[in-house]
Amino acid sequence: LNTTILTPNGNEDTTADFFLTTMPTDSLSVSTLPLPEVQCFVFNVEYMNCTWNSSSEPQPTNLTLHYWYKNSDNDKVQKCSHYLFSEEITSGCQLQKKEIHLYQTFVVQLQDPREPRRQATQMLKLQNLVIEQKLISEEDLGGEQKLISEEDLHHHHHH
């Protein structure tokens, strides 16, 4: 799966090449399964969407996202508070303006809650990921992708 998104300026290549394993899943332990890469874009410095290809999972999995900034005042790990869903499976997280610090190193970690050792972490320079845009239609957002809170996620997960 190769998704090209509006390319922001900066020294970062941002083609979303989500890796789909060709190895049979039964030959791998769950913790060694590759995770989809998280792609983050800041829209008008108003909100940020960090999304991943949930369909790359061998079976539907509500992956969880944590993030933090490398700075002295606020380097505590934060849980995603507003998940994006695609076909009832987590496929992203939306961060609001107050949670966006463009000039600090942003670190995002994706994890399989059923197998905590299965996690992957990456650093992003948010100032390179800003997209200025006027209006986004529902189609541009990739069809049915709705916002959901952390509480809803747990409710969703257990039912």
């Epitope: 970062e12 290549d13 941002t14 083609t15 979303a16 090449d17 989500f18 890796f19 394993t21 913790s31 060694t32 590759p34 995770l35 989809p36 890469e37 792609q39 933090w68 490398k70 700075n71 002295s72 380097d75 505590k76 790990v77 190193t105 670190v107 970690q109 299965r118 996690q119 992957a120 972490t121 990456q122 650093m123 992003l124 320079k125």
Partner: antibody, heavy 121, light 108 residues
């Protein structure tokens, strides 16, 4: 066996090209960020490039930007560094290094043995 | 970019000595500092991460301290195998990652 093994080093003329490889084994390569770090003869360590775990985010040192390209093939557990327009100052041992996160802190917990690149006319 | 300055550049000491190497960052880096040991012809090895956490398998005679801009690597009682070059590395403002210039520890 948990290891990183570099290859592809050699002698090249200024302006020439070389492609380094790093083969990984014994850990979940596809979920790990990997870096290249180099060391000129008798000198200290210099960070060169980083590629994120699935390969779409790449960062470079200013000294190599526009000349070097980092890439990876997670299906083969391999990392590459394509080096073009090589200069004498690129002469160094090149190491690949695995990034590890402990809480919010990152470090290099695994290094390859290195491969030597010599740029000389 | 954040500059890392180590001192001293070289140091002579004897087996059993207590040795201290310092590393200073050009700006505050919180505790985002790592220490590595490198022996001639070998790859670096992680000793200390997050300024003061001992990497698994590293002898307890190695310790790290500091936060902000000033950091210290201490070897409480030098052993023959400790003679090597030591590097500090910041991972606060990354990328780029930056290393100190190294401290060469030699036998007196």
């Amino acid at each position: 066996q948990v290891q990183l093994v570099e290859s592809g080093g050699g002698v090249v003329k200024p302006g020439g090209s070389l492609r380094l490889s790093c083969a990984a084994s014994g850990f979940t390569f596809s979920n790990s960020g990997i870096h290249w770090v180099r060391q000129a003869p008798g000198k200290g360590l210099e960070w060169v490039a980083l590629i994120s775990y699935a390969g779409s985010n790449k960062y470079y040192a200013d000294s190599v930007k526009g000349r070097f390209t980092i890439s990876r093939d997670n299906s083969k557990n391999t990392l590459s560094l394509q080096m073009n327009s090589l200069r004498a100052e690129d002469t160094a041992v090149y190491y690949c290094a695995k990034e590890v996160w402990t809480g919010t802190y990152d470090s290099f917990d695994m290094w390859g043995r290195g491969t030597m690149v010599t740029v000389s006319s | 970019d954040i500059q890392m300055t180590q001192s001293p550049s070289s140091l002579s000491a004897s087996v059993g000595d207590r040795v201290t190497i310092t590393c200073r960052a050009s700006q505050s880096i919180s505790s985002y500092l790592n220490w590595y040991q490198q022996k001639p012809g070998k790859a670096p090895k992680l000793l200390i991460y997050a300024a003061s956490s001992l990497q698994s398998g590293v002898p307890s005679r190695f310790s790290g301290s500091g936060s902000g801009t000033d950091f210290t690597l201490t070897i409480s009682s030098l052993q023959p195998e400790d003679f090597a070059t030591y590097y500090c590395q910041q991972s606060y403002s990354t990328p780029p990652i930056t290393f100190g210039q190294g401290t060469r520890l030699e036998i007196k």
